[in-house]
């Protein structure tokens, strides 16, 4: 009889995670007598996955029954496949003896398991900015393999370029892990804006998986603060109103000052949202002219989303309403219009974007 | 290593029955088939039967046929021949044998079970 | 159904000596591209031990003096110097079709 061989037939097998693989190997010979065994890699630490004499291997299953008559077919099924089981496989011949000696492996079969990545989880700033600046978002997925993926951001549909991604490990592993870094100008507009994050993979058959974010958990848009005089009524009293617009997120509290001190506090609370996902506050304040000998200095004071506040301040001029209605020209505005938050008083520069 | 193990010697009379066991260890024992055999005192081997025990696929000795039975129990990995009607002539020492290469031979024996008969 | 019958029924060896015992089937035991053909030495109060296997092949830790041979219906055991301790009874075994024994083969020391 010729000199027994073993084949392993394929050099390489791929299989998905979850499914099963199919690791081929014969004999050529019946003799000698003697059982076969698995084992993933080489030398001394190799790993024995199967032994069709002894053990127990609920993962495993001999493609053929080892009791069938001449059998030298000794392939074997690995079921529930992971990123775990990549490997080199070898298929090894022993004689039987005390104990059965080994006498002749297979070329080995390299298992690589296709893996797909996990759903991108994309995450953004710890803190809110304002328009104008750049933020960063952070997509992560794990678990693949092969060690190719194809990464892409896009805000708004628009694909980004200004990104910086990594796969790691760098060198051989089971399964691999991307992180991608990519850096978002914010405009105004943004409160309604997304950004994608998209993973192709291989595994994935062309569909590719998305994470996505909100700009608005990123973005904050200071308001514009106007106040305005109505109207004196027949009553002596004036209305002035503070108008606060166009601000995200909606958390804002508005304080009423006449002439510094403390008139009225109230807080934002269920606003309509405007188009641009922005909201829009209306205050009003009263202001008894009759019952003040001089000129009421009157500040609509802001706070919006734990900032330091924004002061808007107005004057109502006593002296201009001797008891005429209809008229506001003697009101004067001291206060300023400028996105930078100085307020009349020019005390505070505060520039948090 | 290989090792069966036989239940102890029996006495048995003519009409009865008897089942002897075999115990395996050292191997996978659903992944090789147990023969029996038995040798009459100062006779030759004569084969009764065999049983795989991944799946109790039995292959008897006509001659046995009607009045031998093999089973497994997995769990244990004992195997067991159940011969029935005993006869005088049935005395004999009863091994089990395991095929380590499914050629249909015998690797390794048992010590052997003594069955008499006698009235 | 295959019949074994082996010859002689007995013989005596010098030691040292060539023992030689035959087996002749009743039909062809080839199958398959082999020769289903098994020998066994039984020494007193043991059980039988597998010498060769497939006509020509010998077991793990069977002296190399013992060898076998023959191929379709006549098949040989062959002991090239006999030792004291190869006194036993020798059988051949088919497995073409299902087992089945020679009547065995006592070897004694001349």
């Known amino acids: 009889e010729e000199e027994l061989q073993v084949i392993q037939p394929e050099k390489s097998v791929s299989v998905a995670a979850g499914e099963s693989a199919t690791l081929n190997c014969t004999a050529t010979s019946l003799i000698p007598v003697g059982p076969i065994q698995w084992f993933r890699g080489v030398g001394p630490g190799r790993e024995l996955i199967y032994s069709q004499k002894e053990g127990h291997f609920p993962r495993v299953t001999p493609v053929s029954d080892p009791t069938k008559r001449n059998n030298m077919d000794f392939s074997i099924r690995i079921s529930n496949i992971t990123p775990a089981d990549a490997g080199t496989y070898y298929c090894v011949k022993f004689r039987k003896g005390s104990p059965d000696v080994e006498l002749k492996s297979g070329a080995g079969t390299e298992l690589s398991v296709r893996a797909k990545p996990s759903a991108p989880v994309v995450s953004g700033p710890a803190v809110r900015a304002t328009a104008e600046h750049t933020v960063s978002f952070t997509c992560e997925s794990h678990g693949f393999s092969p060690r190719d993926i194809t990464l892409k951001w896009f805000k708004n549909g628009n694909e980004l370029s200004d990104f910086q991604t990594n796969v790691d490990p760098a060198g051989k592993s089971v399964s691999y892990s991307i992180r991608s870094t990519a850096r978002v100008v914010l405009t105004r507009r943004d409160v309604h804006s997304q950004v994608i994050c998209e993973v192709a993979h291989v595994t994935l058959q062309g569909d590719p998986l998305r994470g996505t974010a909100n700009l608005s958990e990123a973005i904050r848009v200071p308001p514009f603060l106007e106040v305005t005089q109505q109207s004196m009524r027949a009553d002596n009293q004036v209305n002035v109103t503070c108008q606060v617009t166009k601000f995200y997120p909606q958390r804002l509290q508005l304080t009423w000052l006449e002439n510094g001190n403390v008139s009225r506090t109230e807080m934002a609370s269920a606003l309509p949202e405007n188009k641009d996902g922005t909201y829009n506050w209306t205050s009003w304040l009263l202001v008894n002219v009759s019952a003040h000998r001089d000129d009421v200095k009157l500040t609509c004071q802001v706070e919006h989303d734990g900032q330091p506040a924004v002061n808007k301040s107005f004057s109502v001029k006593v002296s201009a309403h001797p008891k005429e209605q209809g008229s506001n020209t003697a009101a004067e505005n001291t206060g300023t219009n400028e996105r930078d938050y100085k307020d009349d008083d020019d005390k505070h520069h505060h520039h948090h974007h | 290593q290989v090792q069966l193990v036989q239940s102890g010697a029996e006495v048995k009379k003519p009409g009865a029955s008897v089942k002897v066991s075999c115990k395996a260890s050292?191997?996978?024992?659903?992944?090789?088939?147990i023969n029996w055999v038995r040798q009459a005192p100062g006779q030759g081997l004569e084969w009764i039967a065999m049983?795989?025990?991944?799946?109790?696929?039995?292959h008897y000795n006509q001659i046995f046929k009607d009045r031998a039975t093999l089973t497994t129990d997995t769990s244990t990995s004992t195997a067991y021949m159940e011969l029935r009607s005993l006869r005088s002539d049935d005395t004999a020492v009863y091994y089990c044998?395991?095929?380590?290469?499914?050629?249909?031979?015998?690797?390794?024996w048992g010590r052997g079970t003594l069955v008499t008969v006698s009235s | 159904d295959i019949v074994l019958t082996q010859s002689p029924d007995s013989l005596a060896v010098s030691l040292g000596e060539r023992a030689t015992i035959n087996c002749r089937a009743s039909?062809?035991?080839?199958?398959?591209?082999?020769?289903?053909i098994f020998w066994y030495q039984q020494k007193p109060g043991q059980p039988p031990k597998l010498l060769i296997y497939?006509?020509?092949n010998r077991d793990s830790g069977v002296p190399d003096r013992f060898s076998g041979s023959g191929s379709g219906t006549d098949f040989t055991l062959t002991i090239s110097s006999l030792q004291a301790e190869d006194v036993a009874v020798y059988y051949c075994?088919?497995?073409?079709?299902?087992?089945?024994f020679g009547q065995g083969t006592k070897l004694e020391i001349k």
């Open positions: 044998a395991m095929d380590y290469g499914s050629l249909y031979a015998m690797d390794y």
């Open positions: 050292g191997y996978t024992f659903t992944n090789y088939w």
């Open positions: 049983i795989d025990p991944s799946d109790s696929e039995t």
């Open positions: 039909q062809s035991v080839r199958s398959s591209g082999y020769n289903w």
């Open positions: 497939l006509a020509s």
């Open positions: 075994q088919e497995s073409r079709e299902l087992p089945t």
